[in-house]
């Protein structure tokens, strides 16, 4: 069994500022630790590269709703 | 509604280097990715790098690594091209370029273009 | 790199006449999660940059004439000019953005015959 306490933490030390379309986005995960700096989003991309947003930010909200819409939407 | 506008047409001689500028208005540079796309006369249209966000850094076509640095001064919101060891092949019109929309990796909105001339 | 292949290199079409330019990429550039396909087509009259003209390979461009469409999906797609007018004439270009670095066909000529 992992060791919870020992087990590494990812954590967001800096966000990108820079605006993403959702459509190079695959999925995302949120980052709550208390062990981490800041609260924060990582999006994993199309192409599988991960980046640090800030969940305050509309459009990082935005692609949040976007994703979450598309995994509840069954593929026909 | 974002606008570019490009620095004036240059000419050069071989070895020199030329560096192009390009203002961003509309919108701030920070929250763009901006990216420098080349044209030789009467040829295609060819990309020669720009900022990636998915890397977080600024990425070159391979062609023109170890020749090319792109800058960015956010105080002014210009974004700057620099291409070293100038030859003839170079002549071209550069283009900056942006998807205003957000990083997606085409572009829909264009400088308008500047023409580097290098002769001897 | 991704090779992109557009053909023909050029076209003559009468006015009023259907215009088809064909554009292969070397590998796809469709991403099946959300059934996207990274394609770009653009339109550069002489002296100007390019102008984005579809995107997604079938979405039009907002003030982009309805004659204009895009179609296709992973590595084979098509811009069709239905009824092809005077101010068509141009260059036009695709471009596939799944991966970096972006590449870009070599360019078709449509002109009038």
């Known amino acids: 069994q992992p060791d919870a306490i020992n087990a590494p933490v990812t954590c967001c030390y800096n966000f990108t500022n820079r605006k993403i379309s959702v459509q190079r986005l695959a999925s995302y995960r949120r980052i709550t630790s208390s062990k981490c700096p800041k609260e924060a989003v990582i999006f994993k991309t199309i192409v599988a590269k991960e980046i640090c947003a800030d969940p305050k930010q509309k459009w990082v909200q935005d692609s949040m709703d976007h994703l979450d819409k598309q995994t509840q939407t069954p593929k026909t | 509604q974002v606008q570019l506008v490009q620095s004036g047409a240059e000419v050069k001689k071989p070895g020199a280097s030329v560096q192009v500028s390009c203002k961003v208005s509309?919108?701030?540079?920070?929250?763009?990715?901006m990216h420098w796309v080349r044209q030789a006369p009467g040829k295609g249209l060819e990309w020669m790098g720009g900022?990636?966000?998915?890397?977080?850094?600024?990425i070159y076509a391979r062609k023109f690594q170890g020749r090319v640095t792109m800058t960015e001064d956010t105080s002014t919101d210009t974004v700057y091209m620099e291409l070293s060891s100038l030859r003839s092949e170079d002549t071209a019109v550069y283009f900056c370029?942006?998807?205003?929309?957000?990083?997606?990796?085409?572009?829909?909105?264009w400088g308008q273009g500047t023409l580097v001339t290098v002769s001897s | 790199d991704i090779v992109m292949t557009q053909s023909p290199d050029s076209l003559a079409v009468s006015l009023g006449e259907r215009a088809t330019i064909n554009c292969k990429s070397s590998?796809?550039?469709?991403?099946?999660?959300?059934?996207?396909?990274?394609l770009v087509w653009y339109q550069q009259k002489p002296g100007q940059p390019p102008k984005l003209l579809i995107y997604?390979?079938?979405t039009r461009e907002f003030g982009v004439p309805d004659r204009f469409s895009g179609s296709g999906s992973g590595t084979d797609f098509t811009l069709t000019i239905s009824s092809l007018q005077a101010e068509d004439v141009a260059v036009y270009y695709c471009?596939?953005?799944?991966?970096?670095?972006?590449?870009f066909g070599q360019g078709t000529k449509v002109e009038i015959k």
């Open positions: 370029a942006t998807d205003s929309r957000g990083y997606s990796g085409y572009f829909d909105n």
């Open positions: 509309g919108d701030t540079l920070t929250e763009l990715s």
């Open positions: 900022f990636d966000p998915e890397d977080g850094e600024t």
């Open positions: 590998q796809s550039v469709l991403y099946s999660s959300n059934n996207n396909n990274y």
């Open positions: 997604w390979a079938s």
């Open positions: 471009q596939q953005y799944y991966f970096s670095p972006w590449t």
